[in-house]
Interface confidence: medium
């Protein structure tokens, strides 16, 4: 089974090191996941033709991923940390649906996909801690989850395998963007 | 083949501007993350800026914060570096260089630098 | 910032000799770690990434280990073509940094 960050001694800086830090914890899971993205990205792509498909024509496609842009205040030029992490919080919750749906989408990396919505969830708990304006956060409605998840299901296969790599590549540039705009706070 | 052309390097007055530019080919900069590297001479690499595709956001080493700015033109598959207030310390190649696809960063294309030079 | 610090600055050495050099991070960085290869008015190009991990088209003599804060670059058996400077990076946290550079020549 995939270990969980701090599980892992090699990652330990020192024999001897202090506790980790809210933000190094948060750092650290976030770092955990992307192995795990990367690991099923390696599935989907000797799956498919996918991954050589260009960003430009991949990018027709109606999911409505979350992303980072200027007024969310996570870039280096207008950082703004109340209003960033109320947006990765957001995006990370509406990113949820999305990794369930990839939950039967993998054969031998079933674990793997069950380890990042899992450390997903647990990533969401830690940042939640970190919020001051709670209130800011909106989170999707079930229901409009639900049939998003019915519908994305109901997909061709070849839909279906375009839409678990954008999903993952998405992710992942969400991910990285934030490592980055945590790094800040 | 997938290789990064520099240009725009040359001798400059401190307090000068300069500007680099670098065309990608064999692959599109719209979807990977740019970086520009320097070597002052005799000396070691220094991480200058980059730009992350994703957003086109961008971050720069605290050396050069406020005096050099890193942009892209999509449409002619070109990063640049715009060098204000120059400085004698600016001096050094300049390297643009592309981060490979992969979250363990490393540089996996170079260009083959261009020199500049801050002199009066 | 990270610092990151080579040892030795220069290392000499003779065809077929296995050299070691060292890379440390001032504080954890797990596997990000890169080793680029750098020849006069050349530039550099990349040997290993993740910290063990060979870039596609490098020869099998160079390998690359460690975690956290202290890594080796590993030559087991130097060609003429491999004197050159030697970087380790960080890819861990912005700003990343570079080690100083070793400097690998003919004993």
């Known amino acids: 089974a995939p270990v969980l960050p701090g599980e892992d001694s090699k990652d330990v800086a020192a024999p001897h090191s202090q506790p980790l830090t809210s933000s190094e914890r948060i750092d650290k899971h976030i770092r955990y996941i992307l192995d795990g993205i990367s690991a099923l990205r390696k599935e989907t792509c000797n799956r498919s033709n996918m991954c050589e498909s260009s960003k430009e024509a991949l990018a027709e496609n109606n999911l409505n991923l979350p992303k980072m842009a200027e007024k969310d205040g996570c870039f280096q030029s207008g950082f703004n940390e109340d209003t960033c992490l109320v947006k990765i919080i957001t995006g990370l919750l509406e990113f949820e649906v999305y990794l369930e749906y990839l939950q039967n989408r993998f054969e031998s990396s079933e674990e793997q996909a069950r380890a990042v919505q899992m450390s997903t969830k647990v990533l969401i708990q830690f940042l939640q801690k970190k919020a001051k304006n709670l209130d800011a956060i909106t989170t999707p409605e079930p229901t409009t989850n639900a049939s998003l998840l019915t519908k994305l299901q109901a997909q061709n296969q070849w839909l279906q395998d375009m839409t678990t790599h954008l999903i993952l590549r998405s992710f992942k540039e969400f991910l990285q963007s934030s490592l980055r705009a945590l790094r800040q706070m | 083949e997938v290789q990064l052309v520099q240009s725009g390097g040359g001798l400059i007055q401190p307090g000068g501007s300069l500007r680099l530019s670098c065309a990608a080919s064999?692959?599109?900069?719209?979807?990977?993350?740019m970086i520009w590297v320097r070597q002052a001479p005799g000396k070691g690499l220094e991480w200058v800026s980059d730009l992350y595709y994703y957003a086109g956001d961008t971050y720069y080493a605290d050396s050069v914060k406020g005096r050099f700015t890193m942009s892209r033109d999509i449409s002619k598959n070109t990063v640049y570096l715009q060098m204000n207030s120059l400085r004698a310390e600016d001096t050094g190649v300049y390297y643009c260089?592309?981060?490979?696809?992969?979250?363990?960063?490393?540089?996996?294309?170079w260009g083959r630098g261009t020199l500049v030079t801050v002199s009066s | 910032d990270i610092v990151m610090t080579q040892s030795p600055s220069t290392l000499s050495a003779s065809v077929g000799d296995r050299v070691t050099i060292t890379c440390r991070a001032s504080?954890?960085?797990?596997?990000?770690l890169a080793w680029y290869q750098q020849k006069p008015g050349r530039a550099p190009k990349v040997l290993i990434y993740k910290a063990s991990t060979l870039e596609s088209g490098v020869p099998s003599r160079f390998s690359g280990s460690g975690s956290g804060t202290d890594f080796t670059l590993t030559i087991s058996s130097l060609q003429p073509e491999d004197f050159a400077t030697y970087y380790c990076q960080q890819s861990y946290s912005t700003p990343w940094t570079f080690g100083q550079g070793t400097k690998l020549e003919i004993k």
């Open positions: 064999g692959f599109t900069i719209s979807s990977n993350y």
């Open positions: 504080q954890g960085i797990s596997s990000w």
């Open positions: 260089a592309r981060w490979a696809d992969d979250h363990y960063y490393y540089i996996d294309v």
